[in-house]
């Protein structure tokens, strides 16, 4: 029996359902009574789900997994993982035993899009050219950690005097705060781009300083 899985990681958004695909090639005359199937976490070998003795033994992993019972006899041993969490990320092994055995591992990559950044200025009034200002770009509830880029109005990257911090909340999602310290010109636009490296999703925020008033 040959077990096949997707070589590319499965990307799943937090709180959505994911399917970890696994298939095997049943011999002629195969019946589910002959099948033993185990899904487990590859690294810890923690049991996730199993099918044995001709029946689904159910989820051993926070009751959020399911097989596709009608498709098993065709060799579809895929696992459905419901309401994906950050902590579900990792490698899963599909082990199939009939009169032969084989296994293969599939990776689950969890992702969550970042919110549109909010921009704040300090100080935020009586600004004049030559003043040093602190611009903060904040984006929330993303995963994995973001990449943050700053540019000026001409699209020139601003790399000096940037401090970026990322903090995970209780769900494992990141809030990102990036601070740019810059000396004001006569007027200018400062843009912050927060990129999710897995989703290739960019969230943009900008602030334009034209003397008075400020526009965000």
């Amino acid at each position: 029996v040959e077990v096949q899985v997707s070589e590319d990681p499965v990307v799943a958004l937090v709180d959505t359902d994911a399917t970890l695909r696994c298939s095997f090639s049943p011999e002629p005359g195969f019946s589910l009574a002959q099948l033993n199937l185990i899904w487990q976490l590859t690294d810890t070998k923690q049991l996730v789900h199993s099918f044995t003795e001709g029946r689904d033994q159910g989820s051993a992993y926070s009751n959020r997994t399911a097989l596709f019972p009608d498709l098993l006899v065709q060799g579809n041993a895929s696992l459905r993982l419901q309401r994906v969490r950050v902590t579900d990320e990792g490698s899963y092994t599909c082990f199939v035993s009939i009169q032969d055995f084989d296994s293969a591992a599939v990776s689950l990559q969890v992702a969550a899009p970042y919110s549109k950044p909010s921009m704040t200025l300090e100080p935020n009034k009586d600004l004049r050219p030559g003043n040093m200002v602190t611009i903060t770009c904040s984006s929330y509830q993303g995963y994995p950690e973001a990449e943050v880029f700053w540019k000026d109005g001409q699209g020139v990257p601003l790399t000096g005097n940037v401090t970026t911090s990322q903090m995970a909340n209780e769900r494992g999602l990141f809030d990102v705060h990036s601070v740019l310290r810059v000396v004001l010109g006569a007027n200018g636009t400062y843009s912050c781009l927060v990129r999710n490296p897995v989703l290739q999703q960019d969230a943009h925020g900008s602030v334009t300083i034209t003397g008075q008033p400020l526009t965000f």
């Epitope: 033993n36 049991l47 044995t52 035993s97």
Partner: antibody, heavy 118, light 110 residues
Framework: EVQLLESGGGLLQPGGSLRLSCAAS????????MHWVRQAPGKGLEWVAA????????YYADSVEGRFTISRDNSKNTLYLQMNSLRAEDTAVYYC???????????WGQGTTVTVSS | QSVLTQPPSASGTPGQRVTISCSGS????????VNWYQQLPGTAPKLLIY???LRPSGVPDRFSGSKSGTSASLAISGLQSEDEADYYC???????????FGGGTKLTVL
């Protein structure tokens, strides 16, 4: 008739090497997983190693990992166990077994005796 | 130290019913199944029960198996003198990725 016939056992000193063979007949050897299981004198059964039908998936007991190598030649209907760095505790009767549904072993050879002693 | 736990010995008189237990865990018997082997003195083991309760052809129906949760048992009814042997339970352990045997139970027919 389905048969498994082990050979290659013998007496050797600690640190030595030995290769066991198991000749299979009476079934489609290339379609089945195979095992080696051993039994020390007066003791119970201990699983040693398993190999799937095409040799792409192999498992070992912790006690032999890194010292023993299971392999097969489907063109010769033969299973092998290469044993290196042998220890006194490897002394046992070694059985070759055919894999069956539900993790079972439905056919066993008569066994070959390996004695490791100085 | 075996992963599966069996009593080291059991006994009964001819005609009696004898039960041998096998205790495992969620990662072996609980997740998969259990198989039983009989080893008569001086011979190789023989598959007696597979998938917890199925008998291979040629095994008398005096032998039966069952499983509940993480434990299993082998029952022999109408005990006969030729049943005197060692009996082993076995399973696949999903947390170790190995096949595992119980320590064996020596059955004596009195």
């Amino acid at each position: 008739e389905v048969q498994l016939l082990e050979s290659g056992g013998g007496l050797l000193q600690p640190g030595g090497s030995l290769r066991l063979s198991c000749a299979a007949s009476g079934f489609s050897f290339s379609s089945y997983g195979m095992h080696w299981v051993r039994q020390a004198p007066g003791k119970g059964l201990e699983w040693v190693a398993a190999i799937n039908s095409d040799g792409s998936r192999i498992y070992y007991a912790d006690s032999v990992e890194g010292r023993f190598t299971i392999s097969r030649d489907n063109s010769k209907n033969t299973l092998y166990l290469q044993m290196n760095s042998l220890r006194a505790e490897d002394t046992a009767v070694y059985y070759c077994t055919k894999y069956y549904y539900h993790y079972a072993m439905d056919v066993w050879g008569q066994g070959t005796t390996v004695t490791v002693s100085s | 130290q075996s992963v599966l736990t069996q009593p080291p010995s059991a006994s009964g008189t001819p005609g009696q019913r004898v039960t041998i237990s096998c205790s495992g865990s969620r990662s072996d018997i609980g997740a998969t199944t259990v198989n039983w082997y009989q080893q008569l003195p001086g011979t190789a083991p023989k598959l007696l029960i597979y998938q917890s309760h199925l008998r291979p052809s040629g095994v008398p129906d005096r032998f039966s198996g069952s499983k509940s949760g993480t434990s299993a048992s082998l029952a022999i009814s109408g005990l006969q003198s030729e049943d005197e042997a060692d009996y082993y339970c076995a399973s696949w352990d999903a947390s170790l990725n190995t096949w595992v045997f119980g320590g064996g139970t020596k059955l004596t027919v009195l």
